[in-house]
């Protein structure tokens, strides 16, 4: 009796159990009865990734200098090309088709996290006691200057945008 | 017993096209692919590319393109090798083969003898 | 694409000679995918060892194979007459498929 489902790595045709492809090759015949399943490796701009009866290999995914994008890494018979975006740069989705510049955070607020190649950076308000004076991708806010250590008192007090301003203690005569 | 049986030696003048055929039989055609490849002085053996007999897709190897073309007939068990815009290049024999289950290459035609001359 | 470097190009032995044909790959390749012909004048090429040490149906045991990554070899531990041809290995591993240039082995 002719089988109705078959065993993994096989696919059924023509009331036939056949192998499929493994990764990295596509399929050229299927097999019959007398003869085995005919595949066909991928060249090397191509991929597959899994067991499959594909008749075309995929190309492997282009990173586009001109949208920002590197090789991250390199695809082979089995593995799809890896893009991530130049230095400044981050991807704009997941599936990473184009890069937009690492936004900088703005005067009163800090970087919590550094953009990566596919992250963004994260911004966050100075709190009390911290400061940030620059629109930067790289700077944390910083803790104002503490006038006490230097012998000298606040003249004028700090906000998230500016440290305080320190000066001589008044002299009793 | 399988026999690759391909058309007679071409003598044909640069600029031109020609289309060279394999017929397969003593097994069911559309069991395997048919794979071609050139045979010159000057380059030993290339492998033009292959045909999916059953699929009808072709896949080429990229030096090939635009210069080859594969084609099947099924109803006649007959694959074809067409060559475009001959040039002195194209000089070269040109086989058929057939993959068995242990290289893809156990069963060759006899050969054709391809010569561009004006 | 991979290139198959076959040495020597040409060769000549006497009969009862050990005769070694080597082939190095580009890049490395599966050893289920090298597999070696022979041609002589005249005639298609003709299977002899496949999946690098396989000999092909009614092949002389005189004939082997053997090699892996990117460095595979022929041998015919007795050269006779009737093996004066050209021998060619032939990768499947990658697209395209490729072949060394072949090496000549003449009788002495």
């Known amino acids: 009796e002719p089988p109705t489902a078959c065993r993994e790595k096989q696919y059924l045709i023509n009331s036939q159990c056949c192998s499929l492809c493994q990764p990295g090759q596509k399929l050229v015949s299927d097999c019959t009865e007398f003869t085995e399943t005919e595949c066909l490796p991928c060249s090397e701009s191509e991929f597959l990734d899994t067991w499959n009866r594909e008749t075309r290999c995929h190309q492997h995914k282009y990173c586009d200098p001109n949208l920002g994008l590197r090789v991250q890494q390199k695809g082979t018979s089995e593995t799809d090309t890896i893009c991530t975006c130049e230095e400044g740069l981050h991807c704009m989705s997941e599936s990473c088709e184009s890069c937009v510049p690492h936004r900088s955070c703005l005067p009163g607020f800090g970087v919590k996290q550094i953009a990566t190649g596919v992250s963004d950076t994260i911004c966050e308000p100075c709190p009390v006691g911290f400061f940030s004076n620059v629109s930067s991708a790289f700077e944390k806010c910083r803790p104002w200057t503490s006038c006490e250590t230097k012998d000298l008192v606040v003249q004028q007090a700090g906000t998230n945008k500016t440290d305080v301003v320190c000066g001589p203690q008044d002299r009793q005569r | 017993e399988v026999q690759l049986q391909q058309s007679g030696a071409e003598l044909v003048s640069p600029g031109v096209s020609v289309k060279i055929s394999c017929k397969g039989s003593?097994?069911?055609?559309?069991?395997?692919?048919m794979h071609w490849v050139k045979q010159s002085h000057a380059k030993s053996l290339e492998w033009i590319g292959v045909?999916?007999?059953?699929?009808?897709?072709?896949t080429y190897n990229q030096k090939f393109k635009g210069k080859a073309t594969l084609s099947v007939d099924k109803s006649s068990s007959t694959a074809y090798l067409e060559l475009a815009r001959l040039t002195s290049e194209d000089s070269a024999i040109y086989y058929c083969?057939?993959?068995?289950?242990?290289?893809?290459?156990?069963?060759w035609g006899q050969g054709t003898t391809l010569t561009v001359s004006s | 694409q991979i290139v198959l470097t076959q040495s020597p190009a040409i060769m000549s032995a006497s009969p009862g000679e050990k005769i070694t044909i080597t082939c190095s790959a580009s890049?490395?390749?599966?050893?289920?995918?090298l597999h070696w012909y022979q041609q002589k004048p005249g005639f298609s090429p003709k299977l002899l060892i496949y999946?690098?040490?396989n000999l092909a149906s009614g092949v002389p045991a005189r004939f082997s194979g053997s090699g892996s990554g990117t460095s595979y070899s022929l041998t015919i531990s007795s050269m006779e007459a009737e093996d004066a041809a050209t021998y060619y290995c032939?990768?499947?591993?990658?697209?395209?498929?490729?072949f060394g240039a072949g090496t000549k082995l003449e009788l002495k």
């Open positions: 083969a057939r993959r068995d289950s242990k290289s893809p290459f156990d069963y």
């Open positions: 003593g097994y069911t055609f559309t069991d395997h692919g």
């Open positions: 045909i999916s007999t059953s699929y009808g897709v072709a």
């Open positions: 890049s490395s390749i599966s050893s289920n995918y």
């Open positions: 999946r690098t040490s």
């Open positions: 032939h990768q499947y591993h990658r697209s395209p498929l490729t």
